[in-house]
Interface confidence: low
């Protein structure tokens, strides 16, 4: 897969991909996997790929399925380097009270905050 | 401050005394704060409270100024709780499979994505 | 069916040392896993007391062993050595070994403080008592 590929188009296919495998990825019924138990799906990034890679070591390779896990692995890049964008550039306080305000916004406005 | 006001309650708050005390918080103007280079928050919130610790030690303390530092304080730890809830419940495959597809649900249409 | 079966375990004097191994059998999954021991004394929490990566990398240790506890690996016959020395009356606890099959996705095996909820596999545990 050809990393050029834009990251919206990967997230697109693989959703297409984890539906076609559905079936193949939940035949071991003993296995147990942490699922976070709320909707701030960014905050646990780490969990979710680590998730990931406990299904990857114990489901058969081959085909469109290891196309689903490069895949993923890809999105993990993506989201890796959205990471280290966090703390790259330092700006006046002006410009972090701005950040600070717009993150407050968006947890005020869009979070799944259960008290 | 009760740590039972609800969280929701606490974010409102706090943006209104962020707006309060702008002036007063960006009275140092050679300090510098990492601020994140994209608006997907949620990735960045360590590097958010880590200039939120910057800017309280160079702001004098006291009024409403502690209590917005002391916000966001409560507001950290109730992140910090959220983050610990990301991998503290085992699931069968197929409820990690949900949760995986939400998130990439999610990725795809609500994140700011810069290929 | 997998199954990790600790050995080792007993009195030791404090200062005295114990070496603690594990054997895991009937592992499914091709490729390495996160190998980590715990422990648990009457009345607390399992916490976690070394965890790694077996295909490589760093071992985390939890700061109350660092330095007294090393971790080995015998790859020929998947047995997993838990070396413990300088023992302290405050080591008394169950022992448990714990597998799971992490890729290198997750990152934080051997990284980070494992938590015990993220281990599919457990032994049964071992007794260590340490008298001063």
């Known amino acids: 897969i050809p990393t050029e590929i834009p990251t919206s188009a990967l997230v697109k296919e693989t959703l297409a991909l984890l539906s076609t495998h559905r079936t193949l990825l939940i035949a071991n019924e003993t296995l147990r996997i942490p699922v976070p138990v709320h909707k701030n799906h960014q905050l646990c990034t780490e969990e979710i790929f680590q998730g990931i890679g406990t299904l990857e070591s114990q489901t058969v390779q081959g085909g469109t399925v290891e196309r689903l896990f490069k895949n993923l692995s890809l999105i993990k890049k993506y989201i890796d380097g959205q990471k280290k964008k966090c703390g790259e550039e330092r700006r006046r306080v002006n410009q972090f009270l701005d950040y600070l305000q717009e993150f407050l916004g968006v947890m005020n406005t869009e979070w799944i905050i259960e008290s | 401050i009760p740590t039972e006001i609800p969280t929701s309650a606490l974010v409102k708050e706090t943006l209104a005394l962020l707006s309060t005390h702008r002036t007063l918080l960006i009275a140092n103007e050679t300090l510098r704060i990492p601020v994140p280079v994209h608006k997907n928050h949620q990735l960045c919130t360590e590097e958010i409270f880590q200039g939120i610790g910057t800017l309280e030690s160079q702001t004098v303390q006291g009024g409403t100024v502690e209590r917005l530092f002391k916000n966001l304080s409560l507001i950290k730890k109730y992140i910090d709780g959220q983050k610990k809830k990301c991998g503290e419940e085992r699931r069968r495959v197929n409820q990690f499979l949900d949760y995986l597809q939400e998130f990439l649900g999610v990725m795809n249409t609500e994140w700011i994505i810069e290929s | 069916q997998v199954q990790l079966q600790e050995s080792g375990g007993g009195s030791a004097q404090a200062g005295g040392s114990l070496k603690l191994s594990c054997v895991v059998s009937g592992y499914p999954y091709s490729g390495d896993y996160c190998m980590g021991w715990f422990r648990q004394a009457p009345g607390k929490e399992r916490e976690g007391v070394a965890a790694f990566y077996t295909g490589g990398g760093s071992t985390y240790y939890a700061d109350s062993v660092k330095g007294r506890f090393t971790t080995s690996q015998d790859n020929a016959t998947s047995t997993f050595h838990l070396q413990m020395n300088s023992l302290k009356p405050e080591d008394t606890a169950t022992y448990y070994c714990?597998?799971?099959?992490?890729?290198?996705?997750?990152?934080?095996?051997?990284?980070?403080?494992?938590?015990?909820?993220?281990?599919?596999?457990w032994g049964q545990g071992t007794q260590v008592t340490v008298s001063s």
């Open positions: 714990a597998a799971d099959p992490w890729s290198v996705y997750g990152g934080s095996c051997g990284v980070k403080d494992p938590n015990p909820k993220a281990f599919n596999y």
